[in-house]
Interface confidence: medium
């Protein structure tokens, strides 16, 4: 039996700049029941506060609701582990919520096979920003990627589309079924997970509908 090992805060993420969550790895418990507490202060302030919500985001986590989230403020966050033999504290994590946004994936992915006047076929991929993202006001500037592959292929083909919410893919094989996904990233922050997969078959004998 021994004091607990040093915890490590391994991740903090915000879906929308309005709330965020931090998760920690506990380290060894020293063979004893061990309590964990997350405390934080804000840059330039003297007060230290305890995590407002240990439940919402699951075990070994702290959820900061709107009420507790400020942007352009550095949060200085530590996790303390305590058992009857002693305690240990994580290295501090210095977090600015502005930079830890991991949004939901884009929504309403639509796929349409189209044809140019010269009979060249292309796949028109369109989507919308994630619901929570206020793109219009400039609160978020979102960049996108799409990926696609034929059902037979092993590798995804990835296209960066910048701020565009549509993309045309040429040189697809007729008769093949293609899988398509999109993801997005705010100006500062992380790529979302890839969104729901959609599929479409490129017809063998495509003729333009009126």
């Amino acid at each position: 039996q021994s004091p607990p090992g040093k915890p490590e805060i391994h991740k903090c993420r915000s879906p929308d700049k309005e709330t965020f969550t931090c998760w920690w790895n506990p380290g060894s418990d020293g063979g004893l029941p061990t309590n964990y507490s997350l405390t934080y202060s804000k840059e330039g302030e003297k007060n230290t506060y305890e995590c407002p919500d240990y439940k919402t985001s699951g075990p070994n986590s702290c959820f900061f609701s709107k009420q507790y989230t400020s942007i352009w403020k550095i949060y200085i966050i530590t996790v303390n582990a305590t058992n009857e033999m002693g305690s240990s504290t994580s290295d501090p994590l210095y977090v600015d919520v502005t930079y830890i946004v991991e949004p939901e994936p884009p929504r309403n992915l639509t796929l349409e096979v189209k044809q140019l006047k010269d009979k060249k076929t292309y796949l028109w991929v369109k989507w919308l920003p994630p619901t929570i993202t206020d793109v219009k006001t400039g609160w978020f500037t979102m960049e996108y990627e799409i990926r696609l592959k034929s059902e037979e292929a092993d590798e995804w083909e990835i296209h960066f589309t910048g701020h565009q919410t549509q993309f045309k893919v040429f040189d697809l094989y007729p008769g093949q079924k293609y899988l398509v996904q999109t993801r997005c990233k705010p100006d500062h922050g992380y790529w979302s997970r890839w969104g729901q997969e959609k599929s479409i078959e490129i017809p063998n004998d495509f003729t333009l509908k009126d």
Epitope: H10, E43, Y94, V95, T98, Y99, I100, H188, G189
Partner: antibody
């Protein structure tokens, strides 16, 4: 505990090359910008390079631009500095350091390694 | 490049005294995002530099409150309210607002 361990320094002739490594542990390496800083024998400090957490963004001062390349392998938790066309004025102790702030927020070298010595001399 | 000028180069003090180090930048180091990335580092003999203060006045975790930073624009000051033996070493200011980032030449704090 945040730990940075540099290696790869040594004696090299002018015009030669050297690759420094910095092994990182105790934190999620891929979430932090990283820096190389050097200290001359006269004890002046000079920022040499920085690299964004994903490796897509790098910056150098003019004194090393075109000769030095900073890179990282996030799978191996390792930072590198490839130095070529070395000059006597590159003789220094080379430190790797980690940005204080989590992810992309700018500034502050919160953690430093113990340094690795590079001597450029014929 | 932004030139960082530190004064004095050497600062002899008695233990318990207040010490003050000045750092002046050749141009404003207010970043376009409104922050001023002015930092202070202490290098003790035989050790690597350690961060003391970031963004002008914020103490790094574990740094005693006898250290304080102040200033704006181009003029910055590091104050140590009561010097202790463990504070001796070379202090460097650093600006991280404009590339290339630059250090001051250093101020050696030593016993009088």
């Amino acid at each position: 505990e945040v730990k940075l361990v540099e290696s790869g320094g040594g004696l090299v002739q002018p015009g030669g090359s050297l690759k420094l490594s910095c092994a990182a542990s105790g934190f999620t390496f891929s979430d932090y910008y990283m820096f190389w800083v050097r200290q001359t024998p006269e004890k002046s400090l000079e920022w040499v390079a920085y690299i964004s957490n994903g490796g897509g963004s790098t910056y150098y001062p003019d004194t090393v631009k075109g000769r030095f390349t900073i890179s990282r392998d996030n799978a191996k938790n390792t930072l590198y500095l490839q130095m070529s066309r070395l000059k006597s004025e590159d003789t220094a102790m080379y430190y790797c350091s980690r940005q204080l702030f989590y992810y992309g927020s700018r500034g502050a070298m919160g953690y430093w390694g113990q340094g690795t010595s590079v001597t450029v001399s014929s | 490049d932004v030139l960082m000028t530190q004064t004095p180069l050497s600062l002899p003090v008695s233990l318990g005294d207040q010490a003050s180090i000045s750092c002046r930048s050749s141009q404003s180091i207010v970043h376009s995002n409104g922050n001023t990335y002015l930092e202070w580092y202490l290098q003790k003999p035989g050790q690597s530099p350690k961060l003391l203060i970031y963004k002008v006045s914020n103490r790094f975790s574990g740094v005693p409150d006898r250290f304080s930073g102040s200033g704006s624009g181009t003029d910055f000051t590091l104050k140590i309210s009561r010097v202790e033996a463990e504070d001796l070493g070379v202090y460097y200011c650093f600006q991280g607002s404009h590339v290339p980032f630059t250090f001051g030449s250093g101020t050696k704090l030593e016993i009088k």
